[in-house]
Interface confidence: low
């Protein structure tokens, strides 16, 4: 009499999450008599999947008859599949007995289920660096299987290599997560620069998902400062000018000193911005020279995104201007500043 | 006004080597990726060479390894050391400017003459 | 490296003409796209970037569109100086790379 053999034809079978799984198997006679039960996992931990002779299985069901007596076939379709079904299945011909006496199993077909990876999340630093600096970006993507997975960062389309990546968990699991953190180098230039982390994987059928992060919410962009003075006016008035020039954020305060008092405070607000992401602004100064005995000295303060400000001075030359007698009587008279300096921004 | 000059090219025996350079007035050279680009006798454009604002430098394959972009930012100025000169690569080759945040190819050079032959 | 595949390879047309350059790359570059103008013994002169963007001082004639992996150069009306050689060019990753260019003649 030939050996029963029960067939599980494939060794493994991967199905997308969501969709149906068909585990094959087949017995070389049907006697003797007795059921095909479906397990997950061996030994005496092992999982009833599918019993064709009894039992209620709402997502399973028979691919063939099994109640025709000529039917070999003991196939069975899984509906529904989540990353829970993963493991490998036995089909296991049982004798007739009480109990039914296990006769064969199948070698086993393991079910590996495809999960797309979640959307990857990047996460930048929580405080701005600037230039020069290294800062981090963190990138997460949950939920995906198998394990394998590939993830790259790019920086304006360049590929970067300082990154470090992990796949948790590290042994066998229904679902996997990625967690890389990547370290980018800042250039004055990156206001308008994006890092991209990319992952692919199986299930994407090779178009990657991308998770954006940009760069202007990490950088910041300290100010230049030059001040200037204009040539005189012929009412002795020196028009005075701070230029604070390619900074970013936005985010700025400018104070005029005179002689170390504060003669005027300003925010920046609603300034055009330049081609590479900065901004540029312009303070001035009128200073009636002839309404003081002395040279005087003006510093240009900026403080710049809650950093320690910045000085930049310059000393009006009241010596270097022929004094007109009573010609501050209009200026001051004007109400608008007691000091006789008078200023714009722009 | 913002200018390329390229200087060094002339006529060099395959093996040899050759040093050319792209002089920047205008604009800080520093604050940009500069480009080598070349064209040989009757043919199309081809990249050759970038150096980034951070020092990062790239290649096409075939140059790789045989040269090597720098900058002097206290010249202004942008050089392509190229050894093991090849027949192949007699070309003009361009100092090209990229663009400020796109890196978009925005200046040219006029161009200097490479002539590799024997 | 990502290919660059420009078409015609030549083009004759007569002042007035309305012509368009197409090129296509062999991967999606975004609109990383660029295209440049060179006459003999000249310098290439860049007209336009980001696949539509003109180059400062480039007459509004020239227009560029397309994303993705196909781009068109089309010069609106032209005039005797607009015949030359065209190139396009990715610059998405680098290696970049350029069209094997188009030439312009008079029919």
């Known amino acids: 009499e030939e050996e029963l053999q029960v067939i599980q034809p494939e060794k493994s079978v991967s199905v997308a999450a969501g969709d149906s799984a068909t585990l094959n198997c087949t017995v070389s006679s049907l006697i003797p008599v007795g059921p095909i039960q479906w397990f997950r996992g061996a030994g005496p931990g092992r999982e009833l999947i599918y019993n064709l002779k009894e039992g209620h299985f709402p997502r399973v069901t028979p691919v063939s008859d099994p109640t025709k007596r000529n039917n070999m076939d003991f196939s069975i379709r899984i509906s529904n599949i989540t990353p829970a079904d993963a493991g490998t299945y036995y089909c296991v011909k049982f004798r007739k007995g009480s109990p039914d006496v296990e006769l064969k199993s199948g070698a086993g077909t393991e079910l590996s289920v495809r999960a797309k990876p979640s959307a990857p999340v990047v996460s930048g630093p929580a405080v701005r660096a600037t230039a020069e600096h290294t800062v981090s970006f963190t990138c997460e993507s949950h939920g995906f299987s198998p394990r394998d997975i590939t993830l790259k960062w790019f920086k304006n389309g360049n590929e970067l290599s300082d990154f470090q990546t992990n796949v948790d968990p590290a042994g066998k699991s229904v679902s996997y997560s990625i967690r890389s953190t990547a370290r980018v180098v800042l250039t004055r230039r990156d206001v308008h620069s994006q890092v991209i982390c990319e992952v692919a994987h199986v299930t994407l059928q090779g178009d990657p998902l991308r998770g954006t992060a940009n760069l202007s919410e990490a950088i910041r962009v300290p100010p230049f400062l030059e001040v200037t003075q204009q040539s005189m006016r012929a009412d002795n008035q020196v028009n005075v000018t701070c230029q604070v020039t390619k900074f970013y954020p936005q985010r700025l305060q400018l104070t005029w000193l005179e002689n170390g008092n504060v003669s005027r405070t300003e925010m920046a607000s609603a300034l055009p911005e330049n081609k590479d992401g900065t901004y540029n602004w312009t303070s001035w100064l009128l200073v009636n020279v002839s309404a003081h005995r002395d040279d005087v000295k003006l510093t240009c303060q900026v403080e710049h995104d809650g950093q320690p400000a910045v000085n930049k001075s310059f000393s009006v030359k009241v010596s270097a201007h022929p004094k007109e007698q009573g010609s501050n009587t209009a200026a001051e008279n004007t109400g608008t500043n007691e000091r006789n300096i008078y200023g714009g921004s722009g | 006004e913002v200018q390329l000059v390229e200087s060094g090219g002339g006529l060099v025996q395959p093996g040899g080597s050759l040093r050319l350079s792209c002089a920047a007035s205008g604009f800080t050279l520093s604050s940009y990726d500069m480009h080598w680009v070349r064209q040989a006798p009757g043919k199309g454009l081809e990249w050759v060479s970038a150096?980034?604002?951070?020092?990062?430098?790239y290649y096409t394959g075939s140059v790789k390894g045989r040269f090597t972009i720098s900058r002097e930012n206290a010249k202004n100025s942008l050089y392509l050391q190229m050894n093991s000169l090849r027949a192949e690569d007699t070309a003009v080759y361009y100092c090209?400017?990229?663009?400020?945040?796109?890196?978009?190819?925005?200046?040219w050079g006029q161009g200097t003459m490479v002539t590799v032959s024997s | 490296d990502i290919q660059m595949t420009q078409s015609p390879s030549s083009l004759s047309a007569s002042v007035g003409d309305r012509v368009t350059i197409t090129c296509r790359a062999s991967q999606g570059i975004n609109n990383y796209a660029a295209w440049f103008q060179q006459k003999p013994g000249k310098a290439p002169k860049s007209l336009i970037y980001t696949a539509s963007s003109l180059h400062s001082g480039v007459p509004s004639k020239f227009s560029g569109s397309g994303s993705g992996t196909d781009f068109t150069l089309t010069i609106s009306s032209l005039q005797p100086e607009d015949f030359a050689t065209y190139y396009c060019q990715q610059y998405v990753s680098y290696p970049y790379t350029f069209g094997q260019g188009t030439k312009l003649e008079i029919k």
């Open positions: 150096i980034g604002t951070a020092g990062d430098t």
């Open positions: 090209v400017r990229g663009g400020v945040w796109d890196d978009a190819f925005d200046i």
